[in-house]
């Protein structure tokens, strides 16, 4: 059996020892349970010397980042892909991962995830722009493609534990977060629950047991606890704004 290793990291999707699986938020763990230490990528970085992190897919980036070519011109022409900052509400997008947590990509625009989109039986038309070197590219010729996907959605939203690919696959109050073998629908965190504070840096490995994000009106903040000796070991919890 591999030895347990303790690691304290604020890296997004870094792989500390597994923990907190059943209701996890994308990002690394703050509190750590014994387990296997999985290899990550880069060592810790500060914002001062932040380097763009090369990636092959969105999962290698933070939950507030997505994987893409830094300029459209470079896409599909051997241009390296890096983790880019997620796009805020009403910004243009090509897929869900480009939008910041709590948003999803609809008709090429980042929209708030209110779980009312894609109602059962509705015909949903999404414009997806595929770049040749992009994460979900259908064509390999390096030129942008615009495809209108029309799909009738008859299935019910995923319940807790259902396998998903994105949060829009999950029922209200759930998000899609990694749980090792796959991503599954997990509960959005409530007030007082342990959360993961995201930072745009760190050892960009992959966290396999993620937590969901904090629910509406809540923010992930350091728990005010005078018994904690150092900031690095403090728990973050979902707190009212």
């Amino acid at each position: 059996t591999l030895n347990s290793v303790l690691i304290n990291s604020n890296a997004i999707k870094n792989l500390p020892p597994p923990l907190g699986g059943a209701g996890g938020q994308p990002g690394s763990a703050v509190s750590v349970a014994p387990g296997v230490l999985y290899e990550g990528g880069n060592k810790y970085q500060t914002l001062d010397n932040y380097q763009p992190y090369p990636c092959a897919e969105d999962e290698e980036c933070g939950s507030d980042e997505y994987c893409s070519s830094p300029s459209r011109g470079a896409a599909g022409v051997g241009g390296v892909q890096i983790c880019l900052a997620c796009r805020k509400r009403r910004k243009r997008c090509m897929r869900h991962a480009m939008c910041c947590p709590g948003n999803y990509c609809k008709n090429g625009i980042c929209m708030p995830s209110d779980h009312s989109h894609f109602p059962r039986g509705e015909i949903e038309e999404s414009i997806i722009e595929n770049l040749g070197n992009d994460h979900n590219a259908a064509a390999g010729d390096g030129y942008p493609r615009r495809t209108t996907l029309t799909s009738k959605i008859y299935h019910t939203k995923g319940q807790e534990g259902s396998v998903c690919l994105r949060s829009s696959d999950c029922a209200a109050g759930l998000c899609c977060a990694r749980h090792f073998w796959s991503k599954i629908c997990k509960p959005v965190l409530k007030e007082g629950q342990v959360c993961t504070k995201h930072k745009r840096k760190g050892s960009h490995g992959l966290e396999i047991f993620q937590r969901c994000y904090c629910g509406e009106g809540l923010a992930c903040r350091i728990q005010k606890d005078h018994h904690q000796a150092s900031n690095s070991s403090r728990l973050h919890t979902c707190q009212r704004h």
Epitope: S4, P18, L19, G20, G21, A22, G23, A33, P34, G35, V36, E59, N136, Q159, E160, G161, V163, L165, R178, H179, F180, W181, S182, L206, I208, F209
Partner: antibody, heavy 112, light 112 residues
């Protein structure tokens, strides 16, 4: 250290039921799912289903839907898998798994 | 018919490089579900070798690597060693079966 300790080998007659246990330690039991996977002698791995250790919610592979029951006891951090109406081809090693950690397996032999 | 197909056996001499394929379809690997690889020595539980397509747990030598493309995945073992002789399984999720699925398994023989 994360450990999943399974119950001992069982010999059952066709038509009977078997209940295999999996005791977890070294982590917060209710934070994870427990999966059950079986392997017949000389054969490959076959996923049977999972149980959410906290809520007790289950999902079973269609093949086992009518015969399997997964349960858990949070007070003892133990998961259970019961398979009923046993047939000879249910003879297999049954593993419990936390996905990243696996138990050593419980051999169930079905023989008349 | 198996959902994830692997060659039943592969072999190589010590020091050689071998590749094990895992062929799926648009409802599993091709649907963007992750692939994991397990090594199983005789009489033991599966051991995680590669997780989420191409990541290695600590303790797994860097001779082992994984990749995924389209509807298939591959496990490459560079610099074969005698202790690599084992069964290897790929694993993913299939959305048409609503089940986690394992590959058919590949027996690796190290010659000499």
């Amino acid at each position: 250290e994360v450990q999943l300790v399974q119950s001992g080998a069982e010999v059952k007659k066709p038509g009977a039921s078997v209940k295999v246990s999996c005791k977890a330690s070294g982590y917060t039991f209710t934070d994870y799912y427990i999966h059950w996977v079986r392997q017949a002698p000389g054969q490959g791995l076959e996923w049977m289903g999972w149980i959410h250790s906290n809520s007790g919610a289950t999902t079973y592979a269609q093949k086992f839907q009518a015969r399997v029951t997964m349960s858990r006891d949070t007070s003892s951090s133990t998961a259970y898998m019961e398979l009923s109406r046993l047939e000879s081809d249910d003879t297999a090693m049954y593993f419990c798994s936390r996905e990243d950690y696996w138990g050593k397996g419980t051999m169930v032999t079905v023989s008349s | 018919q198996a959902v994830l197909t692997q060659p039943s056996s592969v072999s190589g001499a010590p020091g050689q490089r071998v590749s094990i394929s895992c062929t799926g379809s648009s409802s599993n690997i091709g649907a963007a579900y992750d692939v994991h690889w397990y090594q199983q020595l005789p009489g033991t539980a599966p051991r995680l070798l590669i997780y989420v397509n191409n990541n290695r747990p600590s303790g797994v030598p860097d001779r082992f690597s994984g990749s995924k493309s389209g509807t298939s995945a591959s496990l490459v073992i560079a610099g074969l060693q005698a202790e690599d002789e084992a069964d290897y399984y790929c694993q993913s999720y299939d959305n048409s079966l609503n089940a986690y699925v394992f590959g058919t398994g590949t027996k690796l023989t190290v010659l000499g």
